[in-house]
Structures are given as C-alpha cells and as structure tokens.
C-alpha cells in the first residue's frame, strides 16, 4: 500500500532571465527512493538515479542544473518555460509517486512564490 505523499513548492513564479529551484519532497513512507525524474509536460529534463547519479537531457544542459538535493534548478528563464513540471519518484517497494509544480515566468519584476501544497 502506498502511504507516502509528495510535498512540492506548488504554484511558483519567477522573473524572465532569472532562475528557480524546483523542489519536491517525499514523506510519510519508509520506501527507498531509487530514481527521481523531472519532466516538463512530455519532455524529460533530467533523472537522478540512486546508483548512476544525475543525467541532464543534452537539450537542456545549458539551462538546467542538478540539485539542490533531488531538486532541479532552471536558469536563464524565458516565458516559454511557463507551464507544468512534474517530479516522479520511483520507490521500492511502493512504486511511483508524482508531484506537480506550476511555474509562471513573468516579464515584470514582481514574482511571488505560491503556497506549498501536498499531492497524495
């Protein structure tokens, strides 16, 4: 039975040209995290595998950095980066947990962080 929950940074905003950290945290389970995938819509941005380490998609290498932790840092943001991002936690023995973050990249200098929320 899957008892864990994913806590994410929720709905966030950032300035064009700036950077943002996408962060998820798996709690309420003793399952072992074996791999975390970061996806934007249907595109795989990066994987952090417990055995093999990080692999960043070459298409995003110049603008995506691993970490901190299991999170992902997006740099040199453009308005095209606005959209949904997913952290997909592969665990043993539970299976897969998915968290969602919505990022809005703003032209203006006003960029507020949304409240944290949980996805079961």
């Amino acid at each position: 039975m899957m008892t864990g929950t994913i806590e994410t940074t929720g709905n966030i905003s950032a300035e064009k040209g700036g950077s943002i950290i996408l962060q998820c945290h798996l709690s309420s389970t003793t399952a072992q995290v074996t791999q975390v995938n970061w996806e934007q819509q249907d595109q795989l941005l990066a994987i952090c595998n417990a055995d093999l380490g990080w692999h960043i998609s070459p298409s995003f290498k110049d603008r995506v950095a691993p970490g901190p932790g299991l999170g992902l840092t997006l740099q040199s943001l453009t308005v095209n980066d606005t959209g949904e991002y997913f952290c997909i936690y592969h665990t043993y023995p539970d299976g897969t947990y998915t968290g969602r973050i919505f990022l809005e990249v703003l032209e203006s200098s006003v960029a507020e962080h949304g409240a944290r929320f949980q996805i079961p």
Partner: antibody, heavy 117, light 107 residues
Framework: EVQLQESGPGLVKPSETLSLTCAVS?????????WHWIRQPPGKGLEWIGF???????VYNPSLKGRITISHDTSKNQFSLKLSSVTAADTAVYYC??????????WGQGTTVTVSS | DIQMTQSPSSLSASVGDRVTITCRTS??????LAWYQQKPGKVPKLLIY???TLAEGVPSRFSGSGSGTDFTLTISSLQPEDVATYYC?????????FGQGTKLEIK
C-alpha cells in the same frame, strides 16, 4: 552525424593493462551525454563496463571496479579505457558508445582485443 | 544486480510471421528497458528505449510493450533483413545489464 571510433592494441599480454581510446566526431563530448564502454566476448553477449560524464565524473560496473579507469581528453574530443591485470577472460570486442539516460544510441565499430602471451 | 532473462534463446520463423521475444527482469525496472538488434558481424543498433519508444529510423513493424518485470519485443511482419540477435537492456541502475540474447533466423 555523430561517429565514434575505437583504437588500441589488438593483443595484450596477461597481467598487463589494456588501453583503448574512442575518438568522437560530429559532437563535443563536453556538451552532454555520457560516454560508455561495452564489451562482447567471442560468441557471447554484451557486458557494460562503465562510463564517463561530460563533467569527467565516472561510474563503473562493480564487477570490474578496481581494474577500470575511464578518462577523457576534451581538447582531443576523445575518451579512454584502461583495464588492468587482464586475463584471457578479458578477450572481447570492445565498443564505445554514447549514452542518453543510460541506453546507448550511437555505437563505435568495435575493436577486437585478444589477451594472450 | 538486476538479472535479465530473455526467451527464447533462439527461434526460427517465416517471412511475414509475427515474432515475439520476451525479457524478464529480476526486479521492478518500471519502464526502463531498451532493445538492440545485432546483425551477424555488425555493431548493436538501438531499436527501442523506455519500453516502447522507437529509436530514430526504426521501422514501425518493431514495437515494445510491458512494465515492471515483464517486457516484449514484437516484429509484426518478419522481413529477411530482421535476421539478427536481439538483446534487452535495463537502463535503471548499476550495473547496466543485458539479456543473453535471442538469435532470430528465417525458416
């Protein structure tokens, strides 16, 4: 078009060190992907050896760890394998390959290495 | 280590036949399975990754399915140029491992 080409001595004596190089053309090895070595003993299946990242960090097959060193030379756009204390069991065709999320999308032609005195 | 077991180890089929090769893993690898084709005397070629995604230039008669521990490579209509040995490989942990291969021949 990305191309990989292995080179190195075809014959190595037992207990010596096998040294191979993979020259990459059509893509900069410092621009992403992982760069792997895989081998295939005569008439047998494939065995993954290890890889080097564009950053220079390495991951090795635990069954060979301690005998393997993978390094790269970004100025020459090539990466290399050293396998120490070889025995006849290390006789194989050695392939270099480009890795994307740990599967292999481009392979070199392979080079045959025989371990014999 | 994740063990990869392919079956059958060899098979013979006729041109136009539907051919199925299976790969079973010793533990859950989710969808992280690739298939390669190695023609006699040639270099392995990536056919499929992430269980079902066809690599660039691979004919649509090849398809992959499965998840967890059981996976299948299917050739919908066997062609003479499909004579080869086929290998599965998980791309999920260290060490990366391959199946022992399935040798496919034409009757």
């Amino acid at each position: 078009e990305v191309q990989l080409q292995e080179s190195g001595p075809g014959l190595v004596k037992p207990s010596e060190t096998l040294s191979l190089t993979c020259a990459v053309s059509g893509y900069s090895i410092s621009s992403g992907y992982d760069w792997h070595w895989i081998r295939q003993p005569p008439g047998k299946g494939l065995e993954w050896i290890g890889f080097i990242r564009d950053s220079g960090s390495t991951v090795y097959n635990p069954s060979l760890k301690g005998r393997i060193t993978i390094s790269h030379d970004t100025s020459k756009n090539q990466f290399s394998l050293k396998l120490s204390s070889v025995t006849a069991a290390d006789t194989a065709v050695y392939y270099c390959a480009r890795g994307l999320f740990w599967y292999f999308d481009v392979w070199g032609q392979g080079t045959t290495v025989t371990v014999s005195s | 280590d994740i063990q990869m077991t392919q079956s059958p180890s060899s098979l013979s089929a006729s041109v136009g036949d539907r051919v199925t090769i299976t790969c079973r893993t010793s533990e859950n690898i989710f969808s992280y399975l690739a298939w390669y084709q190695q023609k006699p005397g040639k270099v392995p070629k990536l056919l499929i990754y992430n269980t079902k995604t066809l690599a660039e230039g691979v004919p649509s008669r090849f398809s992959g399915s499965g998840s967890g521990t059981d996976f299948t490579l299917t050739i919908s209509s066997l062609q003479p140029e499909d004579v080869a040995t086929y290998y599965c490989q998980h791309h999920y942990g260290n060490p990366l491992t391959f199946g022992q291969g399935t040798k496919l021949e034409i009757k």
